[in-house]
Interface confidence: medium
């Protein structure tokens, strides 16, 4: 009679992380008496993935009944696949022996691959705001995937981004890999509602990419304009100075008037109005009483928006101008000066 | 066995391109990946990037992109590096060696070319 | 960029000592640590790979060590010819990068 052989028909097996493999493997004769083993891997370091005499295999069943004395199909299942799963697998047949069983034959050999999805892109943008006009940097992680091809691109809204550089880890073979991606983006002043998108395709997702997000509105920070303008006399002697603050982002904004340098309201921005880019605009108005003041009046305009150094505007109200019995604002004048100041006031808030 | 021919030592001014060979034998050359590694006298390595002779995928290093240039000819077995632009802190010893596919170790290296950028 | 920090930079032994020199990445890299020596003049030499595997040829007394971040390469009975420079290099994520070098110098 022919001396048995070991036959695993399949070179390669793909299967989808989460499924179950099939491992197929048959042996051409029932002699010699002995069980077969599977192994994953060859030489001393094989690991031992199913042994037909003894021992727990949970992940393991085989295709036909064991027990039975002429069966020759050694074919095993293994459930729940993950790409540590993957590697080189061998239907080993032993011949019965004292003490020991001894090494008989082995097949050939069968691949498992192990294809996996990659994980939801995670994109994270900078710690700190940044104005319009400057680059930030996103990064978008996905990790898990197998087989090692993938593509990833990066949008900015509905544009594709250009500016930005790929790294898939690790570089040599792996059971699973990482994809790391670094996107350089340019603020601009309507990008509040702006989003930045990383898009990854792999094989394992048919065609249908998963995407991660990043709102700019948490990277950008829109200054302030101001515009101090001197209203109409409301009542005689007095003079209605109001501080427009235009197309600011966020909301977090602190307004201060001085008079003559001289702190006189301090407050919050709270019911601000929104635009339709998402900045906001805000007005502070400030009632000045002429008589009582001798001499000219500088009204000062400051605002500390985000943290930042405090931005101001300033307006000179000639008091000579306003004599008591008249109510003109004509020779009030907005100086337009725009100074910045780099030091904080710490006021009590109005 | 195996081993690794570089090119002979050049001498360039600020400004120029200089390309070095390694000329591969003893092994499959396209079965592995061509490393180059540059060191500035006194100082460690440098990897600059590499190429798979199989399939000519290239990766450089992001320091040196735009001015390297890294190709490889397999039926001659020699790979090549170019660098542009040439500048004196690029006067170094540029190495190549040969690259694992799976834990990308250089495990055989050439003797080393040096390049001397002077005015 | 994976940046990878070696130690000490410089080490004074005497021929028969045990030296161990250790590396450490900016993040995890498995074991995809390569270890080299380098003597004046010449190519570096390919001591260790994968963290722990001896190159063929190598000789039993340096042997690596470690796994994710922390990597060390110990030399058990220090020879004449172990003087040299040696150095770590990640070949987890590109660009591959080196450590700064550990020069071994006589006692």
């Known amino acids: 009679e022919e001396e048995l052989q070991v036959i695993q028909p399949d070179k390669s097996v793909l299967v989808a992380a989460g499924e179950t493999a099939t491992l197929r493997c048959t042996a051409t004769s029932l002699i010699p008496v002995g069980p077969i083993q599977w192994f994953r891997g060859a030489g001393p370091g094989r690991e031992l993935i199913y042994n037909q005499k003894e021992g727990h295999f949970p992940r393991v069943t085989t295709v036909s009944d064991l027990t039975k004395r002429n069966n020759m199909d050694f074919s095993i299942r293994i459930g729940n696949i993950t790409p540590a799963d993957a590697g080189t697998y061998y239907c080993v047949k032993f011949r019965k022996g004292s003490p020991d069983d001894v090494e008989f034959k082995s097949g050939a050999g069968t691949e498992l691959s192990v294809r996996a999805k990659p994980s939801a892109p995670v994109v994270s943008g900078p710690a700190a705001r940044a104005t319009p006009q400057h680059t930030v940097s996103f990064t978008c992680e996905s990790h898990g995937f197998s087989p090692r091809d993938i593509t990833l691109k990066w949008f900015k809204n509905g544009n594709e981004l250009s500016d930005f550089q790929t790294n898939v880890d690790p570089v040599g073979e792996s059971v699973s890999y990482s994809i790391h991606s670094t996107a350089k983006v340019v603020l601009t002043r309507e990008d509040v509602h702006s989003q930045v998108i990383c898009e990854v395709a792999h094989v394992t997702l048919q065609g249908d990419p998963l995407r991660g997000t990043a709102n700019l509105s948490e990277t950008i920070r829109v200054p302030p304009t101001l515009e101090v303008t001197q209203q109409p006399v409301r009542a005689e002697n007095q003079v209605n100075v109001t501080c427009q603050v235009r197309k600011f982002y966020p909301q977090r904004l602190q307004l201060t008037w001085l008079e003559n340098g001289n702190v006189s309201r301090t407050e919050t921005a709270s019911t601000v109005t929104e635009n339709k880019d998402g900045t906001y605009n805000w007005m502070s108005w400030l009632l000045v009483n002429v008589s009582a003041h001798r001499d000219d009046v500088k009204l000062t305009c400051q605002v500390e928006h985000d943290g930042q150094p405090a931005v101001s505007k300033s307006h000179d109200l000639k008091v000579s101008a306003h004599p008591k019995e008249q109510g003109s604002n004509t020779a009030a004048e907005n100086t337009g000066s725009n100074e910045r100041h780099h030091h904080h006031h710490h006021h009590h808030h109005h | 066995q195996v081993q690794l021919v570089q090119s002979g030592a050049e001498v360039k001014k600020p400004g120029a391109s200089v390309k070095v060979s390694c000329k591969a034998s003893?092994?499959?050359?396209?079965?592995?990946?061509m490393h180059w590694v540059r060191q500035v006298p006194g100082q460690g390595l440098e990897w600059m990037g590499w190429?798979?002779?199989?399939?000519?995928?290239?990766k450089y290093s992001q320091k040196f992109q735009g001015r390297v240039t890294i190709t490889r000819d397999t039926s001659a077995t020699t790979a090549y590096m170019e660098l542009s632009s040439l500048r004196s802190e690029d006067t170094a010893v540029y190495y190549c060696?040969?690259?694992?596919?799976?834990?990308?170790?250089?495990?055989?290296w050439g003797k080393g070319t040096t390049v001397t950028v002077s005015s | 960029d994976i940046q990878v920090t070696q130690s000490p930079s410089s080490l004074s032994a005497s021929v028969g000592d045990r030296v161990t020199i250790t590396c450490r990445a900016s993040?995890?890299?498995?074991?995809?640590l390569n270890w080299y020596q380098q003597k004046p003049g010449k190519a570096p030499k390919l001591l260790i790979h994968?963290?722990?595997s001896l190159q063929n040829g190598v000789p039993s007394r340096f042997s690596g060590s470690g796994s994710g971040t922390d990597f060390s390469l110990t030399i058990n009975s220090l020879q004449p010819e172990d003087f040299a420079t040696y150095y770590c290099?990640?070949?987890?994520?590109?660009?591959?990068?080196f450590g700064g070098g550990t020069k071994v110098e006589i006692k």
């Open positions: 060696a040969r690259g694992d596919y799976y834990y990308y170790y250089m495990d055989v």
């Open positions: 003893g092994y499959t050359f396209t079965s592995n990946a």
């Open positions: 190429i798979k002779a199989g399939n000519g995928e290239i």
């Open positions: 993040q995890s890299i498995s074991d995809f």
């Open positions: 994968a963290a722990s």
């Open positions: 290099q990640q070949s987890y994520s590109t660009p591959l990068s």
